[in-house]
Amino acid sequence: APVRSLNCTLRDSQQKSLVMSGPYELKALHLQGQDMEQQVVFSMSFVQGEESNDKIPVALGLKEKNLYLSCVLKDDKPTLQLESVDPKNYPKKKMEKRFVFNKIEINNKLEFESAQFPNWYISTSQAENMPVFLGGTKGGQDITDFTMQFVSS
């Protein structure tokens, strides 16, 4: 069977939504009303990996696009990017590790930890209109907590 994928949107703990910023970047900003339609819809795939009650391995693609969030080293630093893939081969159950995030939910807080780089998390800045990035700090200035809204296909 193919991998099961469900559509969802994400908001950070400051209620900022995620939108496209150019072809290969996401940014976080507050949206209201009709502007909410700009937010990115992810296709979240339940992929192979170590799993527990609080931790589920997922891949985050952009709905109906052949783009996936991935984690790679750039200038020796773990970095978040949007990577183009061959739609004939993705998504799949055994995703390469750079595409895998551990979706961790504890006490109303949802985090996305890179499987490739443990303790590095999908992050947003406190400031408006800044890029979504991979951050190595939890509980600091940058935001690593999200809420998730599943949406019908």
Epitope: A1, R4, N7, D54, E105, N108, D145, T147, S152
Partner: antibody, heavy 119, light 107 residues
Framework: EVQLVESGGGVVQPGRSLRLSCSAS????????MSWVRQAPGKGLEWVAY????????YYPDSVKGRFTISRDNSKNTLFLQMDSLRPEDTGVYYC????????????WGQGTPVTVSS | GIQMTQSPSSLSASVGDRVTITCRAS??????LTWYQQTPGKAPKLLIY???TLADGVPSRFSGSGSGTDYTFTISSLQPEDIATYYC?????????FGQGTKLQIT
């Protein structure tokens, strides 16, 4: 014994609000995703709301989106459904159920609480 | 979304009979299917998940099979306590939807 007990149902006029509660016992509530499923009189089943075990994930079908809000208090082992702008078609028995998006099926159900929306 | 169609909508059978209910999905659901039993005036009860896995405590006379879009629920030897309405439900893609139900009566 694993148990879910709903309360808060009743008769309400169209456009008004109602808040349902579900008290859980016999299992570690904070480890389980939870849902509300409804059944219109003499009809089938419809999944109307989902919340993840910690409360950070939710889902609503289009039929109730923007009108219903699911929430939970893990410290009190209680699930809630806030129903606003109620319509006659929201009439039915509302069941609290264990399970949701990830597992996909509902393995424990409450006895249900009836909701009637009528002028 | 994916629509689930059960057949028949109702059926009568005798104690000891083999009973079969089918459920057809409007798209491939890859065995992400469950079956529930709802006796009159009661809440639904999970019987089968993942198309063929029996839930805890469910008697072995109940079974499920199928793949793709077509699924079957079987009671190998009907018992009086099996009088109920049976529902299928898929969980492949959102929204997860239920079939309209099959009402089983004893002749």
């Amino acid at each position: 014994e694993v148990q879910l007990v709903e309360s808060g149902g009743g008769v309400v006029q169209p456009g008004r609000s109602l808040r349902l509660s579900c008290s859980a016992s016999g299992f570690i509530f904070s480890k389980y995703d939870m849902s509300w499923v409804r059944q219109a009189p003499g009809k089938g089943l419809e999944w109307v709301a989902y919340i993840s075990h910690g409360g950070a994930g939710t889902y609503y079908p289009d039929s109730v989106k923007g009108r219903f809000t699911i929430s939970r208090d893990n410290s009190k082992n209680t699930l809630f459904l806030q129903m606003d702008s109620l319509r006659p078609e929201d009439t039915g028995v509302y069941y609290c159920a264990r399970g949701g998006v990830y597992k996909g099926y509902f393995d424990v159900w409450g006895q249900g609480t009836p909701v009637t929306v009528s002028s | 979304g994916i629509q689930m169609t059960q057949s028949p909508s109702s059926l009568s059978a005798s104690v000891g009979d083999r009973v079969t209910i089918t459920c057809r999905a409007s798209g491939n659901i890859y065995t992400y299917l469950t079956w529930y039993q709802q006796t009159p005036g009661k809440a639904p009860k999970l019987l089968i998940y993942n198309a063929k896995t029996l839930a805890d405590g469910v008697p072995s006379r109940f079974s499920g099979s199928g793949s793709g879009t077509d699924y079957t629920f079987t009671i190998s030897s009907l018992q009086p306590e099996d009088i109920a309405t049976y529902y299928c439900q898929h969980f492949w893609t959102l929204p997860y939807t239920f079939g309209q139900g099959t009402k089983l009566q004893i002749t």
